[in-house]
């Protein structure tokens, strides 16, 4: 247990005096009190100061010491009264809420332990206590008052003799809070039902209170049913039970159920839709779109909601090409429950692979039959670009191959000097080729296109650069004739391919 | 001084509603607590509802219970009473009133603003 | 609901005259309890609050007393500005309830 210094339950000073409180512990300590100005506060190991050189009347208060580390939780408090002669009361708080039936502390602490014997406490505007008003003193603490009243909700203050005259706190206001207990808790059993004609049901509304006067019946569109009900008392709590049992469900058992309880206080009510249909069914949906696009390198959570009754006898992901027959890892493959009725699966794809790309079906199966729901998924890539020098039709010709997905645009640049890449600054010609000739172009493949520029003689000192670009980057090669022929530089950066 | 001006009481269908309100002035108005009195005609007072002075406990008579509702906006110093479903027997002056150093006294009350359900 | 029950519920006297008016409450209510006036086409106005403390301003001839659950109101010496209806209110706890009303008159 932590010890103070210095060693007394209580000490008295003036205003403006020197307080330090020191605190002592086998580990850590830490200081609580009441939020007052001026203090200061040292930490040093096992001892913590707290220490004021200028007190006034609002530092009066309990101040305990506490080791954090101390598993008995010990703790050690010194009461602080600064008697302030113009100041008996220092107020720690001016609204006190409590519910009836609880003690209210009303938080006026005297600054002077002497002044004790002359207090009282009085509502504001003078006025006397209400009789019937049970209430005690410390004054440590302030004033109590013992199972406190809805009618007791007031201003107050604390009185105290001072030299023949009643001084008088700032007031505090007691909120004391009705405990009304509120209509009948509820429950309704399932949320929502779905059976087959022919096929049994049964639906649970159930009510409790504290109190056995209160009301509980089950209603079917608006319609109340009548219900043997069962009654029993557990845990302090009245309970009423209806259960309707239905041994062959129709369509007319369909609709909206009611749970409706009441009391003196108001009523609750849930409800509940039953629906009957004619056989199993089985539906697949998903909010996403079934055609995918999905840049290289990344992921992908493929979702599909699952609306069955009967419940699922099976289901699962197939990949069903074109690249391998590799088939989805089960450990990525997730169900989640929405409610009795609808699930959601995921099958996620991480880090795609070109040999990822194709359709992925979900297949599920209930008495209903089967079902599947198919995704295609087509993977991005920036474009992959290469040129060659080539004749065509006697003419010199640069050939420049771009290969990506989606369809990469190809844009010619002749710029000054040798470079790996033309900069704005050296650009003396630029080509946009709007309609590049498509060379394969296969489902789930990157697209590759060709783009021809004729030049009748090749400068030199110039270079001659292919760009490419898509929604996902972009690639060039630039070209560079030199006397002894021609000399071709892919860009600098490594394109990633994965 | 102090003040209360209830104002929005007319003529008004059964099964209608109506919202009265209490405009406060000359005194702290998120310090009171707030009441709503009616006096049908001929007839003495009967105690509608009360809200504490920072709108956080209502309650109201049994008779209105479901059907009014008291509210405030200290920021504008009003009162307001929302009465849904009238009645006939709603018909009445309604007063507010405040209360200030308990919920009880009714110290300082409106000239009141008349109801009238009728069809 | 605690019922309270005024008595007269009318009443005629003379100027000078020292008026009782009584409130009867069902139940104990200790005391509180207070006591309102009011004037034709007026807003009540109260005047003794917790069954015996009289509201700063209002002149000393009125005055209550009583607790439990039997309560007096007095005017000591009825003057012609004191025409009206005086009610009770109980607030022991809620809903707050009022006492019929005595209607005051000079004869």
């Known amino acids: 247990i932590p010890v103070i210094e210095p060693s007394v339950p209580e000490l008295v000073v003036k205003p403006g005096a020197t307080v330090t409180l020191r605190c002592v512990g086998n580990g850590s300590v830490e200081w609580d009190g009441p939020p007052s100005p001026h203090w200061t506060l040292y930490s040093d190991g096992s001892s913590s100061i707290l220490s004021t050189n200028n007190a006034t009347f609002q530092n009066t208060g309990t101040y305990r010491c506490t080791e954090p580390g101390d598993p008995l939780g010990g703790s050690a408090a010194i009461h602080l009264y600064v008697k302030d002669p113009a100041r008996p009361w220092n107020v720690l708080a001016q609204e006190v809420v409590v519910f009836e039936d609880q003690d209210a502390l009303l938080p006026c602490l005297l600054t002077d332990p002497v002044l004790e014997a002359g207090v009282s406490l009085v509502r504001v505007r003078g006025r006397p206590l209400m009789r019937h008003t049970n209430y005690s003193f410390s004054p440590w603490h302030g004033f109590t008052i013992h199972r406190a009243k809805f009618i007791q909700s007031q201003d107050y203050q604390c009185s105290a003799l001072m030299g023949g005259r009643k001084v008088m706190s700032i007031s505090i206001r007691l909120k004391v809070q009705k405990v009304i207990p509120g209509p009948p808790a509820l429950t309704l059993v399932p949320a929502e039902l779905v059976r087959i004609r022919g096929e049994a049901a049964q639906i649970v509304c159930s009510a409790s209170s504290v109190d056995v006067n209160f009301d509980v019946f089950l209603q079917h569109n608006n319609t109340k049913l009548a219900i043997p009900q069962q009654s029993d008392f557990h845990n302090n709590r009245y309970q009423k039970v209806l259960t309707l049992n239905l041994d062959q469900v129709d369509f007319q058992h369909a609709g909206n159920y009611s749970c409706v309880a009441s009391n003196v206080q108001g009523k609750h009510s849930t409800s509940m839709f039953f629906r009957v249909v004619e056989s199993a069914y089985l539906n697949l949906s998903s909010e996403q779109n079934l055609i995918q696009e999905v840049t290289v390198g990344e992921g992908l959570n493929l979702k599909v909601m699952v609306e069955a009754y009967p419940g699922l006898q099976g289901f699962n992901w197939t990949y069903l090409g074109p690249f391998s027959d590799h088939q989805p890892e089960p450990k990525l493959a997730n169900a989640t429950t929405k409610d009795t009725y609808r699930h959601t699966f995921t099958l996620s794809l991480p880090r795609l692979k070109p040999s990822e790309a194709g359709r992925y079906s979900f297949l599920a199966r209930n008495p209903g039959g089967w079902r599947a729901l198919t995704f295609e998924l087509t993977l991005r890539y920036p474009p992959e670009v290469s040129v060659i020098w080539t004749f065509i039709n006697g003419s010199g010709t640069l050939l420049c191959a771009a290969s990506g997905y989606p369809q990469p645009n190809v844009t010619w640049l002749q710029c000054s000097g040798h470079t790996d890449r033309c900069d704005e600054a050296q650009v003396l010609q630029v080509w946009d080729d709007p309609y590049p000739e498509v060379l394969s172009q296969e489902p789930f493949h990157k697209v590759t296109v060709q783009s021809l520029l004729t030049v009748e003689t090749l400068e030199h000192n110039q270079t001659y650069e292919c760009r490419a670009h898509n929604s996902v980057g972009s690639g060039s090669w630039a070209f560079i004739p030199i006397s002894a022929g021609a000399h071709t530089h892919p860009p600098d950066e490594f394109l990633f391919t994965p | 001084q102090v003040q209360l001006v209830e104002s929005g009481g007319g003529v008004v269908q059964p099964g209608r509603s109506l919202r009265l309100s209490c405009a406060a002035s000359?005194?702290?108005?998120?310090?009171?607590?707030m009441h709503w009195v009616r006096q049908a005609p001929g007839k003495g007072l009967e105690w509608v509802a009360v809200i504490w002075y920072d709108g956080s406990n209502k309650y109201y008579a049994d008779s209105v219970k479901g059907r009014f509702t008291i509210s405030r906006d200290n920021s504008k110093n009003t009162l307001y009473l929302q009465m849904n479903s009238l009645r006939a027997e709603d018909t009445a002056v309604y007063y507010c009133?405040?209360?200030?150093?308990?919920?009880?006294?009714?110290?300082?009350w409106g000239q009141g603003t008349t109801v009238t359900v009728s069809s | 609901d605690i019922q309270m029950t005024q008595s007269p519920s009318s009443l005629s006297a003379s100027v000078g005259d020292r008026v009782t008016i009584t409130c009867q409450a069902s139940q104990d209510i200790s005391n509180y309890l207070n006591w309102y006036q009011q004037k034709p086409g007026k807003a009540p106005k109260l005047l003794i609050y917790?069954?015996?403390n009289l509201e700063t301003g209002v002149p000393s001839r009125f005055s209550g007393s009583g607790s439990g659950t039997d309560f007096t109101f007095t005017i000591s010496s009825l003057q012609p500005e004191d025409i009206a209806t005086y009610y009770c209110q109980r607030y022991d706890d809620l809903p707050i309830t009022f006492g019929q009303g005595t209607r005051l008159e000079i004869k």
């Open positions: 009133a405040s209360s200030s150093s308990n919920f009880y006294d009714m110290d300082v």
């Open positions: 000359g005194f702290t108005f998120s310090s009171y607590g």
């Open positions: 917790d069954a015996s």
